[in-house]
């Protein structure tokens, strides 16, 4: 009897032995199943971000060609109203030109003297930008960049006045401390009469004979 | 590619007449003002005339006023530069470019060369 029972024990615990070997084989299985299947999901997961990502890209980049075409075609047909029309009206901005508030604006690549600068603008039925307020003056910034660049705005003729007739006096100023100078040392002969945004915005007067680049400004009519 | 392509110059009497041209490619030349320029020996470059687009406005420098004419052929893609009454001052390379341009868009010029 007692011989019988050792017998089943040994069994016993043998197949307990086994059962737990097994188990752990099992449990070790599914848990490299479990990491595998874990590394797979987040594969899956990072596939699938990137791609959300991706698309949301798409997206947008295909919005904002879609929002150029609509100004484009919008630009071309008021371009062909004005062609057809007498050209007295202008209701939108001529190709390349950048329009704000009501006016259109072009900037130039290359540099010449203010007075060239000038003729230039007037040939494009315009004038050298005159500049009436902050939010104008940033936005110029804004397409300029750092550089040098011509305005409407000169002394040549005595006091400081704008191209366009806009009173200097009482309107929007922004000249470097201690400008305008008319400073004489440069060396080129006379003053400087001819006033240009510096590489950080603020106005300074120079010799207007000098190269620099312009921007050209024109109003826009109402449209009827 | 933009290719601006002056013909006309050569040797001239002062008093003389010439009639320069100048022949585009590479762009929509109806969609530019264009001008002359000019650079005589050992100066700098200088502006002679400009004309708007539809060639209603044109500009001159003093120094040419009631002597040259600037004309334009959109039909053609063709720039012209009428020069009367020449003068020695008036020998220099003469180009055509699009207004407003950089450099790289300026022809090779012909020269003009006021000389009895």
């Known amino acids: 009897q007692n011989s019988q029972l050792r017998e089943d024990l040994l069994a016993l615990r043998q197949n307990f032995s086994n059962l737990t070997v097994s188990t752990e084989d099992q449990v070790k299985a599914l848990s490299t199943q479990g990491s595998s299947v874990g590394r797979k999901m987040k594969l899956v997961e990072s596939k699938l971000e990137k791609q959300q990502k991706d698309l949301t890209e798409d997206h947008s980049s295909l919005l904002l060609h879609v929002k150029q075409l609509v100004s484009d075609v919008r630009s071309l047909s008021c371009q062909m109203a004005a062609f057809r029309g007498n050209g007295s009206e202008r209701t939108c901005c001529p190709i390349n030109w950048v329009e704000y508030e009501g006016s259109c604006y072009w900037f130039s690549s290359s540099v010449r003297p203010w007075t060239e600068a000038d003729k230039y603008c007037q040939l494009e039925n315009a004038h050298l930008v005159v500049v009436t307020s902050r939010d104008e003056q940033n936005f110029l910034q804004r397409h300029m960049g750092p550089l040098n660049t011509w305005i409407g705005l000169t002394d040549q003729n005595g006091p400081w006045k704008w191209v366009d007739g806009t009173d200097y006096e009482t309107g929007f100023q922004n000249w470097r401390p201690e400008q305008p100078d008319n400073w004489y040392g440069h060396g080129l002969g006379g003053g400087e009469d001819c006033a240009h945004f510096t590489t950080d915005g603020r106005w300074n007067d120079d010799v207007c004979r000098r190269p620099y680049r312009w921007v050209c400004e024109t109003k826009l009519d109402k449209a009827n | 590619e933009v290719q601006l392509l002056e013909s006309g110059g050569g040797l001239v009497q002062p008093g003389g007449s010439l009639r320069l041209s100048c022949a585009a490619s590479g762009f929509t030349f109806a969609d530019y003002p264009m001008e002359w320029a000019r650079q005589a020996p050992g100066k700098g470059l200088e502006w002679v005339s400009g004309?708007?687009?539809?060639?209603?406005?044109?500009y001159y420098a003093d120094s040419v006023k009631g002597r040259f004419t600037i004309s334009r052929d959109n039909s053609k893609n063709t720039l012209y530069l009428q020069m009367n009454s020449l003068r020695a001052e008036d020998t220099a390379v003469y180009y055509c470019?699009?207004?407003?341009?950089?450099?790289?868009?300026w022809g090779q010029g012909t020269l003009v060369t006021v000389s009895s």
């Open positions: 470019a699009k207004m407003g341009s950089n450099f790289d868009y």
């Open positions: 004309i708007s687009r539809d060639g209603s406005r044109t």
